[in-house]
């Protein structure tokens, strides 16, 4: 039953909380089989999604997945938004579902997350690279 | 070959808190796209989906009863464990757990045989 | 919530013949991502349910190609081509393009 579709793992209501000023690499966990497709990042300006061209991405192969970064180096708040990553792969388009960064300005404490906040969101208290796509394999 | 089984109490008492565990085979919880979800018929009536735990142990709930539920995972085991809280005489259903695959979002493709659970004093 | 409605909800069939259930949806399953989360499900006497369609029209494993589904936006169908004893039961759609997910309230179908 193993299928050789394309599949992007993000999950609908996706979302990291990070802090402006430090790095974060948002990832796009890619399936496929034999030719690696391109993809690509967007974000979301309302209805349309404005691809993203000039920022720094990479691969990262694992075993039975890969993982398309967006590096944030660092983030800065006006990346706050959705993001959605799309592959092509012969001739078919695949879009992922929309990411969501909440960025906190390190400047502005009162919009810092709440002690509640941090113990519903527990990786808010990672750094970015232990930030809250646990990849298990 | 994929196969889900739950098992729990087939009687609860009214306020009690109702354990169930789906012990599953076949695949395994830590591959991306692989999701459990919980969901439940009363006697007659139709599905009422519950919760769900993703591959990276995300988790999501119906709004109308997320205030009485957890759900939890245990990769090493095969199980996950749906909790719910002040059980009532109209939580009598029968309980099934069901596997999420994944073609771009979650879709149903095994169930487990489903337990009944009755509520009452 | 995304209310799923079903018709009809009883459905006498006779063997050999075709036979179609219509589901509906209160908002449009076209989700952002271009894909339309419909699915449907079999549950025949007794036992618990089986998937039969995801994805609007495709086939699950196993399932044999008598079963077809169709639709958009919020109008959906499910046809048995020719039906056989083995497909009698109750048929479920679902959606998981709106948390929460939901289903239809079933369609029995019996034969004639």
């Known amino acids: 039953k193993e299928s050789c579709d394309v599949q992007l793992y993000i999950k609908r209501q996706s979302e990291h909380s990070i802090l402006a000023g430090d790095p974060f690499e948002l990832e796009c966990p890619v399936k496929y089989c034999a030719n690696r497709p391109h993809v690509t990042w967007c974000k979301l300006n309302g209805t349309t999604c404005v691809k993203l061209e000039d920022r720094q991405t990479s691969w990262k192969e694992e075993k039975n997945i890969s993982f398309f970064i967006l590096h944030f180096e660092p983030v800065l708040p006006n990346d706050n938004g959705s993001y959605r990553c799309s592959a092509n792969f012969q001739s078919n388009l695949i879009e992922s579902h929309s990411t969501t960064l909440y960025v906190t300005d390190v400047k502005s404490a009162s919009e810092r997350p709440s002690k509640d906040e941090m113990a519903s969101r527990p990786w808010l208290l990672y750094r970015h690279h232990h930030h809250h796509h646990h990849h298990h394999h | 070959q994929v196969t889900l089984k739950e098992s729990g109490p087939t009687l609860v008492k009214p306020t009690q808190t109702l354990t169930l565990t789906c012990t599953f085979s076949?695949?395994?919880?830590?591959?991306?796209?692989?999701?459990v979800s919980w969901i439940r018929q009363p006697p007659g009536k139709a599905l009422e989906w519950l919760a769900h735990?993703?591959?990276?142990?995300?988790?999501r709930f119906n709004p109308s009863l997320k205030s009485r539920l957890t759900i939890t995972k245990d990769t090493s085991k095969n199980q996950v464990v749906l909790t719910m809280t002040n059980m009532d005489p109209v939580d009598t259903a029968t309980y099934y757990c069901?596997?999420?695959?994944?073609?771009?979002?979650?879709?149903?493709?095994?169930w487990g045989q489903g337990t009944l659970v009755t509520v009452s004093s | 919530d995304v209310v799923m409605t079903q018709s009809p909800l009883s459905l006498p069939v006779t063997l050999g013949q075709p036979a179609s259930i219509s589901c509906k949806s209160t908002?449009?399953?076209?989700?952002?991502?271009?894909?339309?989360?419909l699915n449907w499900l079999q549950q025949r006497p007794g036992q618990s349910p089986r998937s039969l369609i995801y994805?609007?029209?495709k086939l699950d494993s196993g399932v044999p190609d008598r079963f077809s589904g169709s639709g958009s936006g919020t109008d959906f169908t499910l046809k048995i081509s020719r039906v056989e004893a083995e497909d009698v039961g109750v048929y479920y759609c679902?959606?998981?393009?709106?948390?929460?997910?939901?289903f239809g309230q079933g369609t029995k179908v019996e034969i004639k």
């Open positions: 069901a596997r999420g695959n994944w073609d771009g979002e979650t879709y149903f493709d095994y």
């Open positions: 076949g695949f395994s919880l830590s591959t991306f796209g692989m999701g």
């Open positions: 735990i993703y591959w990276d142990d995300d988790k």
């Open positions: 908002q449009s399953l076209l989700d952002s991502d271009g894909k339309t989360y």
């Open positions: 994805l609007v029209s």
């Open positions: 679902w959606q998981g393009t709106h948390f929460p997910w939901t």
